[in-house]
């Protein structure tokens, strides 16, 4: 019968006793940077080409006994998970292996860097189809390794890496912390985060998604027909590399940004028990388990968006946090979040010719996060319209006044330390959905975009009594681009998007008490692109 991990990543319409996905990734080459491998294992023979690249440190210990099957164990298993003919994800993908880890599974930053350079040169000498690079390794944070990954990604290569097995914030490790890399955490058959002894999968904002990574059956280097179970984020990353190979084989022109958005979009949502993660990491960690798309074609009509969290600003009074979208993505909205509730909002601003989302800490605050909503919107022309603090008691408002521009997000930012609880809520005038509204002491920023066929609408959900969390979701066929709270709710900790749902978080009700200011309204801006829908219909 089908191994649990292959069943888990398979959409229901393809499920059978045997794993037989529609396209095996035959147009894609996957580079594996790992240990040596047993290339004559019948699971991978003829599918994996062992390059002559080897850059590994000496094994530790004088009594270390180099046994071939042990040296090959990790790499052979991963090659099998990616493209094995029996238990592999992308059965048609061809692979090339580079040895950067020694028989004890240890490597160096320099060895990995030279390996990445080897791939870049190979790509220049003999350009092939789409390339996926699997980096099933994790070490301490390395600026130079992250930069090398960025360079390769910008050359059109898809890099997939393990989040790490340290039960820690993945942002503290490389290459997991490189924004251009697709970073994968591990889950088990119950869709729970994988525990490995006293440790387990890494987590946090640097993880893009999770994938099966416990009791994964794959080729064993013990013998030509041997199989073995292994666990870890390396195995999880191998699943995503396989899924990526299949997606790229079906749509070879996909960019890294498009691929990442599709991986997120087609993942199983909200199935992971977040209680496993440290409390402060739960909101930052994506609740996504990788899966193959239900169809390898025809996803182009969708407006894809993802949420990108910044690093924590730190607690200093003027501290700020910045969240950035990938080069091919548009920043359609910006929000902020603070666990203490002390923040001075957020704004979208230009930086290096691109919009970024900046959140501001407040005096006495423990720090803030900036949350960017990053979307794929071809031929988009977006700008930010700002209204300075208003004198009028009606509050500050700003709208998209350019012809053909629609509102995709609202942000507000204030200079005063505390907007105070005595100010009455500002209600949005009915019939004027294309504008952002805020406190009179706040400057308001509207994200206004023009793109072919783009249409957006505002959806609100208000709760009169105090609630720790208020949500509003976009309906089927619409994508959440903006998420904010209506002003007047001074105890709001912030707003952020989780998949297609806008979440507004408030202070613990028991500490705020029930007052007239208890009302919380979550405001979602939901968009769709008729142009993308028409384009995909024409292609079919």
């Amino acid at each position: 019968s089908i191994p649990w991990n292959l069943e888990r990543i398979t959409p229901p319409r393809y499920r059978a006793d045997e794993y037989q996905p529609p396209d095996g990734g035959s147009l894609v080459e996957v580079y594996l940077l790992d240990t040596s491998i047993q290339s004559d294992h019948r699971e991978i023979e003829g599918r994996v080409m062992v390059t002559d690249f080897e850059n590994v440190p000496e094994e530790d210990g004088t009594r270390f006994h180099r046994q071939a099957s042990k040296c090959d164990s990790h790499g052979t298993h991963l090659a099998g998970v990616v493209s094995g003919r029996d238990a592999g994800v992308a059965k048609g993908a061809s692979m090339r292996s580079l040895r950067v880890l020694n028989c004890q599974g240890k490597g160096t930053v320099s060895g990995t860097l030279i390996g990445l350079e080897f791939i870049r040169k190979s790509q220049l000498v003999q350009p092939v189809g789409p390339l996926v690079v699997l980096l099933p390794l994790a070490g301490g944070y390395s600026r130079v390794l992250n930069a090398a990954c960025q360079r390769l990604a910008r050359a059109g290569v898809v890099l997939v890496t393990a989040a790490g097995n340290f039960r820690d914030d993945a942002c503290l490790y490389s290459p997991a912390s490189a924004p251009e890399v697709i970073t994968v955490g591990a889950t088990n058959a119950q869709d729970q985060p994988v525990t490995l002894g006293t440790l387990g999968t890494n987590f946090g904002r640097c993880v893009d998604l999770f994938a099966p990574g416990e009791d994964i059956i794959g080729a064993s280097s013990d013998c030509s027909t041997c199989f073995v179970s292994q666990s870890g984020t390396s195995q999880a990353a191998a699943h995503v590399a396989g899924i990526a190979a299949m997606m790229l084989s079906a749509e070879p022109e996909l960019t890294l940004a498009e691929l990442r958005q599709r991986l997120i979009h087609f993942s199983a949502k909200d199935v992971i028990n977040e209680a496993w993660f440290p409390e402060d990491q739960r909101v930052l960690t994506p609740n996504l388990v990788a899966a193959l798309p239900p169809s390898t074609h025809g996803a182009g009509w969708q407006l894809f968006c993802r949420t990108v969290w910044s690093a924590h600003s730190g607690p200093t009074r003027m501290a700020t946090a910045v969240a950035r979208c990938a080069p091919d993505e548009e920043l359609l909205s910006c929000s902020s979040f603070s666990r203490s509730g002390k923040r001075r909002g957020e704004r979208m601003e230009a930086q290096g010719g691109k919009l970024v989302c900046r959140a501001h800490n407040a005096f006495g605050g423990e720090g803030v996060y900036a949350i960017a909503r990053c979307c794929l919107l071809p031929q988009a022309n977006c700008s930010v319209h700002t209204a300075p603090p208003a004198e009028a008691s009606m509050g500050t408002r700003v709208h998209c006044h350019q012809q053909g521009h629609v509102l995709t997000g609202c942000s507000s930012h204030w200079e005063v330390e505390d907007l105070g609880t005595h100010k009455p809520p500002v209600l949005r005038p009915r019939g004027q959905p294309n504008q952002c509204v805020g406190h009179r002491e706040a400057s308001i920023h509207a994200s206004c975009c023009h793109a072919p066929g783009l249409e957006c609408k505002v959806k609100e959900h208000g709760i009169p009594a105090p609630q720790e969390q208020v949500t509003v979701a976009c309906e089927e066929g619409w994508t959440l681009t903006g998420c904010s709270a209506l002003p007047g709710t001074s105890h709001v900790l912030g707003a952020y998007a989780v998949d297609n749902t806008c979440v507004v978080r408030s202070r613990d009700v028991s500490t705020t008490g029930s007052t007239s200011e208890g009302a919380v309204t979550a405001v979602a801006i939901c968009c769709r692109s008729r142009h993308l829908a028409q384009a995909s219909q024409e292609l079919q």
Partner: antibody, heavy 119, light 113 residues
């Protein structure tokens, strides 16, 4: 039910070519390996080689490499064993059998094809 | 290649008596990663294809009578027929399936005394 049905007995002259077949049914043919085994008259079993019909990956016993060709047509769930130039020493019973990655031994066998090569 | 050697070449046992066949591999077929012995036993009756009896050295194939049992580990293995029946007259082969080329023992012929 799961079965492998082999083509009928063949009588050939030395130097002639031959292709015998093995058709699988009752299971997912592309997800199992097909093994070919030779048994010369009054002798034991010899493993000749293997094919994975999913991608036509083959592995031969060095003893038979270059002497025979193993192939498969997954569209009709059939594996083949062929000779381009038969020799008298090829006279034997040839069996096909299937195996799976989780059970890499031969759990189902064909009935056998007797090949006689004589001038 | 892994060489499989069976003993004896032939064996005559009275009905209802125990028959024991040995098989030795030239190198271990036990693998530490999954703690399995990659060894199978087959029965071949005259004019029939071989039939799987035992795999992983000691696991009986479904439908095989429980008088057949396999034991051993590493390089030394045994097939035991606890109470020989008339229908057990056949040639028995051991096989290692861990390494290419896959190899069989030369066979042990079991007859009734």
């Amino acid at each position: 039910q799961v079965q492998l049905v082999q083509s009928g007995a063949e009588v050939k002259k030395p130097g002639e070519s031959l292709k015998i077949s093995c058709k699988g049914s009752g299971y997912s043919f592309t997800n199992y390996y097909i093994t070919w085994v030779r048994q010369m008259p009054g002798r034991g079993l010899e493993w000749m080689g293997i094919i994975y019909p999913g991608d036509s990956y083959t592995r031969y016993n060095p003893k038979f490499q270059g002497q025979v060709t193993i192939s498969a047509d997954k569209s009709i769930s059939t594996a083949y064993l062929q000779w381009s130039s038969l020799k008298a020493s090829d006279t034997a019973m040839y069996y096909c059998a299937r195996d799976h990655w989780s059970k890499p031994f031969s759990d189902v066998w064909g009935q056998g094809t007797l090949v006689t090569v004589s001038s | 290649d892994i060489v499989m050697t069976q003993s004896p070449d032939s064996l005559a046992v009275s009905l209802g008596e125990r028959a024991t066949i040995n098989c030795r591999s030239s190198q271990s077929v036990l693998y530490s990663s999954n703690n399995k012995n990659y060894l199978a036993w087959y029965q071949q009756k005259p004019g029939q294809p071989p039939k799987l009896l035992i795999y992983w050295a000691s696991t009986r194939e479904s439908g095989v009578p429980d008088r057949f049992s396999g034991s051993g580990s590493g390089t030394d293995f045994t097939l035991t027929i606890s109470s020989l029946q008339a229908e057990d007259v056949a040639v028995y082969y051991c096989q290692q399936y861990s390494s290419f080329p896959i190899t069989f023992g030369q066979g042990t012929k079991v007859e009734i005394k």
